[in-house]
Amino acid sequence: EEELQVIQPDKSVLVAAGETATLRCTATSLIPVGPIQWFRGAGPGRELIYNQKEGHFPRVTTVSDLTKRNNMDFSIRIGNITPADAGTYYCVKFRKGSPDDVEFKSGAGTELSVRAKPSHHHHHH
């Protein structure tokens, strides 16, 4: 059986400030068992954006219903984007472990760029 791959089909996404960003991610297999997490950045300082296993992340919604047992679509939407959200986002599959889950495979990353809202200048005559 082929090993699970984490596919992030979009190398980059451009979103206007105030809009919603969709970051796409799919897994090619249900095995191994374990959660998906999304991070901004890589390495030890990376920022957790969404964790399938724990917590409620008010700005993040999943595109698919992750409670469905055969789901392999782990795409997310992040609402009300600001320039501070710019960066590279990684979809990471974890393998169930004891006591802690173990990072198994990461997607290649999607770079989110934020286009500033056009400012409306009022000209006084």
Epitope: N51, Q52, E54, H56, D65, T67, S98
Partner: antibody
Framework: EVQLVESGGGVVQPGRSLRLSCAAS????????MIWVRQAPGKGLEWVAS????????YYADSVKGRFTISRDNSKNTLYLQMNSLRAEDTAVYYC?????????????WGQGTMVTVSS | DTQLTQSPSSLSASVGQRVTITCGAS??????MHWYQQKPGKQPKLLIY???NLEAGVPSRFSGSGSGTDFTLTISSLQPEDFATYYC?????????FGQGTKLEIK
């Protein structure tokens, strides 16, 4: 077989404290978020508190915030609810339940409940 | 908070009858609505999760549908063991909330 067994209920005076326990067996406790739900006599279900698998995320109902504390010991497969400053309106059957993975998942197994009566 | 309103609050029906219980949410909960059955003196039991998914071991006469704010639990042909109280519950956002319950009684 999945089992959740609550204990620690009883009769207590208003203002006093009580600690409920929920002993889990038949599944990998550390994989599951856990929840306390209560049911006042003759009433419906009310969510009280929830705790994620590693205790990183904890939520409380407004009605118990600041008075109740949910915790877990994964090495003992046990969930706890520390209830302080108890009020008459806390009188209820308290159920523990498990929730697979994240916040959106349902409560798929429940304990049989333990009765807490707050009365002077 | 997301308020859930079940209808009807109580219902009398006969064995073999088709029964529908509805649950309305005060705002969208997407598909994160679950249904439980509770018999007197017993703990609740999960029937349907995420609007339409039958929990393992639950008879196929139970079904669920809906998304957003309007949800339905249907029992296609009532059996004697189905007389109980049914609750909907949302898990879209904290706090978790339950409907007030629908008591299904034998006619």
């Amino acid at each position: 077989e999945v089992q959740l067994v609550e204990s620690g209920g009883g009769v207590v005076q208003p203002g006093r404290s009580l600690r409920l326990s929920c002993a889990a067996s038949g599944f990998t406790f550390s994989d599951y978020g856990m929840i306390w739900v209560r049911q006042a006599p003759g009433k419906g279900l009310e969510w009280v508190a929830s705790i994620s698998s590693s205790s990183s995320y904890i939520y409380y109902a407004d009605s118990v915030k600041g008075r109740f504390t949910i915790s877990r010991d994964n090495s003992k497969n046990t969930l706890y609810l520390q209830m302080n400053s108890l009020r008459a309106e806390d009188t209820a059957v308290y159920y523990c339940a498990r929730r697979y993975y994240g916040f959106n998942y349902p409560f798929d197994y429940w304990g049989q409940g333990t009765m807490v009566t707050v009365s002077s | 908070d997301t308020q859930l309103t079940q209808s009807p609050s109580s219902l009398s029906a006969s064995v073999g009858q088709r029964v529908t219980i509805t649950c309305g949410a005060s705002k969208s909960v997407r598909t994160y609505m679950h249904w439980y059955q509770q018999k007197p003196g017993k703990q609740p039991k999960l029937l349907i999760y995420s609007a339409s998914n039958l929990e393992a071991g639950v008879p196929s006469r139970f079904s669920g549908s809906g998304s957003g704010t309007d949800f339905t639990l249907t029992i296609s042909s009532l059996q004697p063991e189905d007389f109980a109280t049914y609750y909907c519950q949302q898990s879209n956002e904290p706090p978790y909330t339950f409907g007030q319950g629908t008591k299904l009684e034998i006619k």
